[in-house]
Amino acid sequence: EKPVYELQVQKSVTVQEGLCVLVPCSFSYPWRSWYSSPPLYVYWFRDGEIPYYAEVVATNNPDRRVKPETQGRFRLLGDVQKKNCSLSIGDARMEDTGSYFFRVERGRDVKYSYQQNKLNLEVTALIEKPDIHFLEPLESGRPTRLSCSLPGSCEAGPPLTFSWTGNALSPLDPETTRSSELTLTPRPEDHGTNLTCQMKRQGAQVTTERTVQLNVSYAPQTITIFRNGIALEILQNTSYLPVLEGQALRLLCDAPSNPPAHLSWFQGSPALNATPISNTGILELRRVRSAEEGGFTCRAQHPLGFLQIFLNLSVYSLPQLLGPSCSWEAEGLHCRCSFRARPAPSLCWRLEEKPLEGNSSQGSFKVNSSSAGPWANSSLILHGGLSSDLKVSCKAWNIYGSQSGSVLLLQGRSNLGTGVVPAAL
């Protein structure tokens, strides 16, 4: 009866350079329980080598010399007593490519090389990239542990060296970036930046890297309000904006955050549950009315918090003037000027281009001002007759502009009301 030596092992296996592979293997050999029990030794050899002289690539025999180039990288895994000859190959090198055969020895009776079942190992170029693991989403200000690992790599062979690069790492100690793990406290400005983990096998030319784009979740830090593409100045969460009455107004509220905050506009200073007047970052007023003077609030709502800014809208108008008109009354020549403006304008009367300020000490003229609704009225009373033709002007102005009107008083006319010549702007 022929002794039965059998080996189950795959014919070929492919592994990328620098990675690891486990080759399952089982064997059988003729053994009788009545034999003596010398130790069972198993070996993996390079094909073409004579087992009696060659250094082994892996063995459980402590007396056999292992090839220095495979020492620690080729290992027997599993229990050989249970006929397990599985071979673990770590930190695969191009020069490992080739065929290998298995051999069993037990005393003088069992010695056999399984030359019919060779393992063909092919080591190919490394294309595997490392994985960067972390709990998503990254939150601004919250420390997060990141780890870098290469699928298919193992502890065998020289240690792996790591290097991390990226703008988010600038404050880190360089030593920290040489570990497979690092703790990162992302900032809002790190969102969208690249983080790269590079792995290299010490003493080898095998290098691989992966780059990820950081998705940093952060609440809005600032709100900016734009008008015609120009940012409004903001002081203590309030922005002041003067708007010409009747003008169309389009404001854009921007609050950089990730994911984008929900932007809305409210009238005045709203309560948290108030209803917005706009559910976007855009506030449009077709014609600004003075009634809208006061404020609007832009609120940026975000899962990580909210921010809001108050817009103090001041509605202004250029002075509008009616007059002057003059008429003779009992006490003398009576001229009236009506005007309207926001903010309230200042007004002055001129007689022949000379300003008339307050009331004359000699009583030659008197100025009276009153207001009713949006209009304000001023009157000028000139006592005494006119010596010659006169030009009476009134001028209204505020910080936004001015308007003036004048009337020519012709000597000898009894009714001056018809001779009103309103001044052009």
């Epitope: 080598e49 004579i50 060659a54």
Partner: antibody, heavy 119, light 112 residues
């Protein structure tokens, strides 16, 4: 029990060839290296070469490279040594020896076969 | 080639005496795998050689313990503690570390 049975040899004419055989039994044929050793009458031992059926590995002593050719037939578990262009210098007893194991020794020997080269 | 020099060529002994044979190699016979393949064989008249010692100092199975081997590098010794009649014959040292493998010239152990 490992046995190496030798045959062939005898009286041969100069300039001819002779093929010696060494038939193995009692072990797995591919597991032994078979060596050939020459011993001239009253002289010492000389290693000719080896044949390892496991991987068909053959090694020669340079001195015998043009003299001896080693082959094998796995089906009959036999290793052969052919000696060519015989001269009187080739008259000797030729042994085959089995070498198995890491210990590197020729632990089993054939009985030897005599070759006499004479016209 | 590694030259193996055995001394003495002839060693006359009385039965029960100790015998010692020396073998000197022309170069180190440590194999690239770390082993030293130095062996001793005994050839009795009309017989094939028989293995006594392998790898310098290991006795082959069935070899009596009166045989012992020692040495390292280039100098090796075979000792027989108490010579018996069956020990007579020619002793050869042999190196299997470097091709071509080579034998010593032989030492004849004979009765005084």
């Amino acid at each position: 029990q490992v046995q190496l049975q030798q045959s062939g040899g005898g009286l041969v004419k100069p300039g001819t060839s002779v093929k010696l055989s060494c038939k193995a039994s009692g072990y797995i044929f591919t597991e032994y290296i078979i060596h050939w050793v020459k011993q001239r009458s009253g002289q010492g031992l000389e290693w000719i070469g080896w044949f390892y059926p496991g991987i068909i590995s053959i090694k020669y002593n340079e001195k015998f490279k043009d003299k001896a050719t080693l082959t094998a037939d796995k089906s009959s578990s036999t290793v052969y040594m052919e000696l060519s262009r015989l001269t009187s210098e080739d008259s000797a007893v030729y042994f085959c020896a089995g070498h198995e194991g890491y210990d590197g020794a020729m632990d089993y020997w054939g009985q030897g076969t005599s070759v006499t080269v004479s016209s | 080639d590694v030259l193996m020099t055995q001394t003495p060529l002839s060693l006359p002994v009385s039965l029960g005496d100790q015998a010692s044979i020396s073998c000197r190699c022309s170069q180190s016979i440590v194999h690239s795998n770390g082993n030293t393949y130095l062996e001793w064989y005994l050839q009795k008249p009309g017989q094939s050689p028989k293995l006594l010692i392998y790898r310098v100092s290991n006795r082959f199975s069935g070899v009596p313990d009166r045989f012992s081997g020692s040495g390292s590098g280039t100098d090796f010794t075979l000792k027989i503690s108490r010579v018996e009649a069956e020990d007579l014959g020619v002793y050869y040292c042999f190196q299997g570390s470097h091709v071509p493998w080579t034998f010593g010239g032989g030492t004849k152990l004979e009765i005084k």
